[in-house]
């Protein structure tokens, strides 16, 4: 029977920067039941807290609540582990909640063929951002990431949309029923999980384009 | 304990391209984004561009895009920085870094010297 | 890019005595997300730098009080208030609010 293991603070995640939730992996627990907290400080300050809910993001995780969450304060944390034997503490970790910001998948993909008499046809999609998002204040861009295949193939092609919100591809097999789905990510944080599928078949008369793709 | 052991000391020829490794312990890699810093002998400090382990996102310094590749392999927890088309001016010491989740990094490798000399 | 102007190049100070370096940048510092991504490295001699003070005023883990940060906007100043023989190598001011992060040229400290 041993103190636990060094506990490692490894993720922290942001819906919409309002509220976050840091998650820890233990060591090894010696062989007896093991209590972990998490305390923390922000910048500026020296009175330390404890985790304000442990329940919220599952286990060995520690979520904050908009009441605790500022953007404007780094936030210095650390995990304790205890049992019978003694104790252990992670390394201190810092987190700046601008970049642990993972948004919600985008919202509303439609997607069309577009077949112009003027020109080639093409594939036309657009989305909107996740709503919980606000793109308003300036600070915050959001890439975007396109993925798209045949619904039986196995293989996606995926194509950065950089921070448009609209897409065209002009290359696209004729007759083929098409699964699209589209990402997003902060600048300096974590993609999105992919957009629930949106299908398009794809006219037996579209005509191939040699140019791949472009941005709207 | 934290550390960033970078590969050796490299000499390349001018118009070569030299990889530098960092390899990451002590952490879990997929976590922090890795920076890469060089310093020109006697000079100041040059940000090249950084790397998010998790999914290769990069951002570059446009000085180095185009002629800098950043790289990592997870399952050796290791970061590398290539250079191409190299010149005299690129002799330098070439730093990695690590960040918490934050814009800023603290922990940095020993640094590599890579001179360019024909 | 910003660019980052340390004063003065160098520096002799008598172990005990207080020691202050300036640090200007070509554009405000101010994050727009209200943050000021202004922090202070120190490269001792044969070494990797090594951060002392990130976001302005905050000490990071392990340095000693005698460090100090303070400025705002594009004024930031970093002050040793009693100097020691370890405080001696190169001062780096650096900002990771716009990209590319930039780097000062640098102030070399060494004792009397």
């Known amino acids: 029977q041993l103190p636990p293991g060094k506990p490692e603070i490894f993720k922290c995640r942001s819906p919409n920067k309002e509220t976050f939730t840091c998650w820890w992996r233990p060591g090894t627990d010696g062989g007896l039941p093991t209590n972990y907290s998490l305390t923390y400080h922000r910048e500026g300050e020296t009175l330390m807290h404890e985790c304000p809910d442990y329940i919220t993001g599952g286990p060995n995780s520690c979520h904050f609540g908009k009441q605790y969450t500022s953007m404007w304060r780094t936030y210095v944390m650390m995990v304790n582990a205890t049992n019978q034997m003694g104790s252990s503490f992670s390394d201190e970790l810092y987190v700046d909640v601008t970049y642990i910001v993972q948004p919600d998948p985008p919202l509303e993909l439609t997607v069309e063929v577009k077949q112009p008499e003027d020109r080639k046809p093409y594939l036309w999609m657009k989305w909107s951002p996740p709503t919980l998002i606000d793109l308003k204040t300036g600070w915050f861009t959001l890439l975007y990431e396109i993925r798209l295949k045949p619904e039986k193939a196995a293989e996606w092609e995926t194509h950065f949309a950089g921070q448009q919100t609209e897409f065209k591809i002009l290359s696209l097999h004729p007759g083929q029923k098409y699964l699209v789905q589209v990402r997003c990510k902060p600048d300096h944080g974590y993609w999105s999980a992919w957009s629930p599928a949106t299908f398009i078949q794809i006219p037996s008369d579209f005509i191939m384009n040699d140019h791949h793709h472009h941005h709207h | 304990e934290v550390q960033l052991v970078q590969s050796g000391a490299e000499v390349k020829k001018p118009g070569s391209s030299v990889k530098v490794s960092c390899k990451a312990s002590?952490?879990?890699?997929?976590?922090?984004?890795i920076h890469w810093v060089r310093q020109a002998p006697g000079q100041g400090l040059e940000w090249i561009g950084e790397?998010?382990?998790?999914?290769?996102?990069?951002n570059y310094n446009q000085k180095f895009k185009g002629r800098a590749t950043l790289t990592v392999d997870k399952s050796s927890s290791t970061a590398y920085m290539e250079l191409s088309s190299l010149r005299s001016e690129d002799t330098a010491v070439y730093y990695c870094?690590?960040?918490?989740?934050?814009?800023?990094?603290?922990?940095w490798g020993q640094g590599t010297l890579v001179t360019v000399s024909s | 890019d910003v660019v980052m102007t340390q004063t003065p190049l160098s520096l002799s100070v008598t172990p005990g005595q207080p020691a202050s370096i300036s640090c200007r940048s070509s554009q405000s510092l101010v994050h727009s997300n209200g943050n000021t991504y202004l922090h202070w490295y120190l490269q001792k001699p044969g070494q990797s730098p090594q951060l002392l003070i990130y976001?302005?005023?905050n000490r990071f883990s392990g340095v000693p009080d005698r460090f100090s940060g303070s400025g705002s906007g594009t004024d930031f100043t970093l002050k040793i208030s009693r100097v020691e023989a370890e405080d001696v190598g190169v001062y780096f001011c650096?900002?990771?609010?716009?990209?590319?992060?930039?780097f000062g040229g640098g102030t070399k400290v060494e004792i009397k």
């Open positions: 790397i998010d382990p998790s999914d290769s996102y990069t």
């Open positions: 650096s900002q990771s609010t716009h990209v590319p992060f930039t």
């Open positions: 002590g952490y879990t890699f997929t976590s922090y984004w």
């Open positions: 870094g690590r960040s918490f989740f934050t814009n800023w990094f603290a922990y």
């Open positions: 976001k302005v005023s």
